[in-house]
C-alpha cells in the first residue's frame, strides 16, 4: 500500500540535492584557500540534519545552528553588497570586484543558491515531489527559514558603507517585503553601519530618469534615517557599461556618469 | 566604530589553563552578542563560542564545551574566555569579534595560545 504523503503548494526538493550540496562544498573549498579545513561531509551532515524528519512546516532558526557554526568565515564587514530582485548583475559585479561579497559569495550562499529542499516529519526522506510554499502553505519551511537567518546575519555583520543593489525596472524597486526589505535592512547595526548606499540599476536604454526619487526609494530613505543610519542613493544608467568601468576604471570612458 | 584588544595568550603545557580577555570600545558592548573565535596555524577561521549581550544564551563549539567558559563584564566593556584542560589543538591565534557568525570580521590583533610541552 504506497504512503499517503502531503502534496505542497511548491516545487519539489531540486534532484540530486544532497549530490548538489556537497560538489559545492568541494569546489567552494578548492577556490577559496582558507575555506580548505571545512569538512564538506560534516556540512552536508549539517544541512541534512536542520530539515530531515522534521515538519516543513515547523523549522527553526535553531535548526540550521549546527550549520551556522561549520560556515564559519571572515568576511570584511565593509565590503558588504546586499541586493533585491536583480541577483545576476550583483553577482557578475563581485566576481568582477573580488574584494566585495554578496552573500552568494559566502560557503552558506554558495551551497543554497537556486535550490529547494524539504523533508517529512517522521521519515529520513527527502520530498522531491512538492515542498511548502511560503505564502500558499507556511512560511517557515526549511528554504525560508535558512535564508532568513543566514541574510539575518549578514546584514548583523556589516559595518560603515553597505551597498544595495535594486531592480529599477519593478513596480516596487524598494518592496517591503522582499528579504532585503523585511529582514536585511533592520537588522543593519546602526552603532557599526554609517550610510546604507543604494544602486538603482535601469533597465531601459534611454531611460533618464531619477529613480533615486522613486515613492519606495524615499520609503526606504525614511526606514533607514529612523535607525539613525545614514542614506545615499545612485542611479546606474548603464549597468553593461557600469560592469564593463567595474573592470577598467582607467577607460577614458568611464569619467562620465554611467 | 567597534574596537576590540585581546590579551592573556601564552606558552601553556598540555592540562592546564589560561584566562582569554578581550576589553572593547567604540559600541554600547551590552547590545552586542560577542564571540570568540580561532585560527590555528594553516588552518581557518574556527568559531569557539558566543554569549549574549545579557549573558542568558551561551553557545560552544563541541571541542572545547567542558573546557572553556565564556563570560563577559557589561560594566567593563570586556569579554572572557577561561581555557581549562588545554590540549595541543586549541594552539591558535584566538580573536574576539561582534556577534555570533557565521560571518566575522574581526577587529582586534588577537592573541596567541600555545599548548606545548
Known amino acids: 500500500v504506497p504512503r499517503w504523503r502531503q502534496q505542497w503548494s511548491g516545487p519539489g526538493t531540486t534532484k540530486r540535492f544532497p549530490e548538489t550540496v556537497l560538489a559545492r562544498c568541494v569546489k567552494y573549498t578548492e577556490i577559496h584557500p582558507e575555506m580548505r579545513h571545512v569538512d564538506c561531509q560534516s556540512v552536508w551532515d549539517a544541512f541534512k540534519g536542520a530539515f530531515i524528519s522534521k515538519h516543513p512546516c515547523n523549522i527553526t532558526e535553531e535548526d540550521y545552528q549546527p550549520l551556522m557554526k561549520l560556515g564559519t568565515q571572515t568576511v570584511p564587514c565593509n565590503k558588504i553588497l546586499l541586493w533585491s530582485r536583480i541577483k545576476d548583475l550583483a553577482h557578475q559585479f563581485t566576481q568582477v570586484q573580488r574584494d566585495m561579497f554578496t552573500l552568494e559569495d559566502t560557503l552558506l550562499g554558495y551551497l543554497a543558491d537556486d535550490l529547494t529542499w524539504c523533508g517529512e516529519f517522521n521519515t529520513s526522506k527527502i520530498n522531491y515531489q512538492s515542498c511548502p510554499d511560503w505564502r500558499k502553505d507556511c512560511s517557515n519551511n526549511p528554504v525560508s527559514v535558512f535564508w532568513k537567518t543566514v541574510s539575518r546575519r549578514f546584514a548583523e555583520a556589516a559595518c560603515d558603507v553597505v551597498h544595495v543593489m535594486l531592480n529599477g525596472s519593478r513596480s516596487k524597486i524598494f518592496d517591503k517585503n522582499s528579504t532585503f526589505g523585511s529582514v536585511e535592512v533592520h537588522n543593519l547595526q546602526p552603532e557599526k553601519v554609517q550610510t546604507l548606499e543604494a544602486w538603482v540599476i535601469h533597465g531601459g536604454r534611454e531611460d533618464s530618469r531619477d529613480l533615486c526619487q522613486d515613492p519606495t526609494i524615499k520609503e526606504l530613505e525614511s526606514i533607514i534615517s529612523k535607525r539613525n543610519i545614514q542614506f545615499s542613493c545612485k542611479n546606474i544608467y548603464r549597468p553593461d557599461k557600469f560592469l564593463q568601468c567595474v573592470k577598467n576604471p582607467e577607460d577614458s570612458s568611464c569619467t562620465s556618469e554611467i | 566604530e567597534v574596537q576590540v584588544l585581546e590579551s592573556g595568550g601564552g606558552l601553556v603545557q598540555p592540562g592546564g589553563s589560561l584566562r582569554l580577555s578581550c576589553a572593547a570600545a567604540?559600541?554600547?558592548?551590552?547590545?552586542?552578542?560577542m564571540s570568540w573565535v580561532r585560527q590555528a596555524p594553516g588552518k581557518g577561521l574556527e568559531w569557539v563560542s558566543s554569549?549574549?549581550?545579557?549573558?542568558?544564551?551561551?553557545d560552544y563549539a563541541d571541542s572545547v564545551k567542558g573546557r572553556f567558559t565564556i563570560s563577559r563584564d557589561n560594566s567593563k566593556n570586556t569579554l572572557y574566555l577561561q581555557m581549562n584542560s588545554l590540549r595541543a589543538e586549541d594552539t591558535a591565534v584566538y580573536y574576539c569579534?561582534?556577534?555570533?557568525?557565521?560571518?566575522?570580521?574581526?577587529r582586534g590583533q588577537g592573541t596567541l595560545v600555545t599548548v606545548s610541552s
Open positions: 567604540g559600541f554600547t558592548f551590552s547590545n552586542f552578542a
Open positions: 569579534a561582534d556577534g555570533t557568525g557565521p560571518f566575522f570580521d574581526y
Open positions: 554569549i549574549s549581550g545579557s549573558a542568558g544564551t551561551i
